[in-house]
């Protein structure tokens, strides 16, 4: 009696259980009563990442430099190419199909987390006692200068965008 279900890594065709082709290989012809499945490797720049009965391999992803992309990991016959973004850029999606320039944190904000190839810069407002006077994708909020440790006094209070201004202590004559 012909089978209605097949074992793992097999498929049912013409009432016959045939072996699936291994990752990296495509199906050329199905098995018969007398012959095994015919499989051949994927061509250059092609891949199949599962046990399969595909008659065509998938093309490796192209990391288009015009979109700010570069190859992070070269594809094989069993894996797709992994793209990432050029320095200073990050992916717009998980699939990393294009890149955008990393965001800079405005004055009054510092970098909480530096951007990576796949995530943008995370900014945070500078809390009391800290400032940032530049627009930057790298600079954290800096602490206000401690006038006391320099035997100076605060002449001008700091803000989230400016450091304190220290000056000499008034001398008693």
């Amino acid at each position: 009696e012909p089978p209605t279900a097949c074992r793992e890594k097999q498929y049912l065709i013409n009432s016959q259980c045939c072996s699936l082709c291994q990752p990296g290989q495509k199906l050329v012809s199905d098995c018969t009563e007398f012959t095994e499945t015919e499989c051949l490797p994927c061509g250059e720049s092609e891949f199949l990442d599962t046990w399969n009965r595909e008659t065509h391999c998938h093309q490796h992803k192209y990391c288009d430099p015009n979109l700010g992309l570069r190859v992070q990991q070269k594809g094989t016959s069993e894996t797709d190419t992994i793209c990432t973004c050029e320095e200073g850029w990050h992916c717009t999606s998980e699939a990393c199909e294009s890149c955008v320039l990393h965001r800079s944190c405005s004055p009054g904000f510092g970098v909480k987390q530096i951007a990576t190839g796949v995530s943008d810069t995370i900014c945070e407002p500078c809390p009391v006692g800290f400032f940032s006077n530049v627009s930057s994708a790298f600079e954290k909020c800096h602490p206000w200068t401690s006038c006391e440790t320099k035997d100076l006094v605060v002449q001008q209070a700091g803000t989230n965008k400016t450091d304190v201004v220290c000056g000499p202590q008034d001398r008693l004559r």
Partner: antibody, heavy 119, light 107 residues
Amino acid sequence: EVQLVESGGDLVKPGGSLKLSCAASGFTFSSYGMSWVRQTPDKRLEWVATISSDGSHTYYPDSVKGRFTISRDIAKNTLYLQMSSLKSEDTAMYYCVRQGRYVPSFDVWGAGTTVTVSS
Amino acid sequence: DIVLTQSPATLSVTPGDSVSLSCRASQSIRNNLHWYQQKSHESPRLLIKDASQSISGTPSRFSGSGSGTDFTLSINSVETEDFGMYFCHQTNNWPFTFGSGTKLEIK
């Protein structure tokens, strides 16, 4: 008995052409992918061409791509290798081989035919 | 292209010795590695397919092992008829490639 018999090897001048044949018997020729493999005078083996069982897929290394063509005639149980623009580095013993279906290892080899490219 | 490096290039042994022939791939080829024996003035003959599967007619003293990049052909107690060339061959990627061979000779 499974058998592969090559013919057509000859002495040919650089730039010349040659067609090798391989007569298959003792198995269902149309069920198997076939290949040509050559062995150079220094005894190195080099894969030259592959054709799938139905003839729909052909593959070549860069060294022969555009110069060599593999084909098959199912009705005649014969495999062919058309070679053109021959170079001295094509000098070798050419073997016709049958491939396993699921695993394309070369499970049957012919006795070979000698191709010499020299002026 | 995948490069297959066979070692040693020549192995001189006495009948009765047990030997191991190595084949190393330049990148992973899963288990798509095959071994051939070629005696003087003869065509190559498939001994082992898929790294470790014996072919019908291959004597039991021959065995294959390995996966990925490192493969071994072992001959348990070499017989005089075993002398000749041994080639490894990968069919994981195009172009198919062969190792340069190991010559097994009588000491």
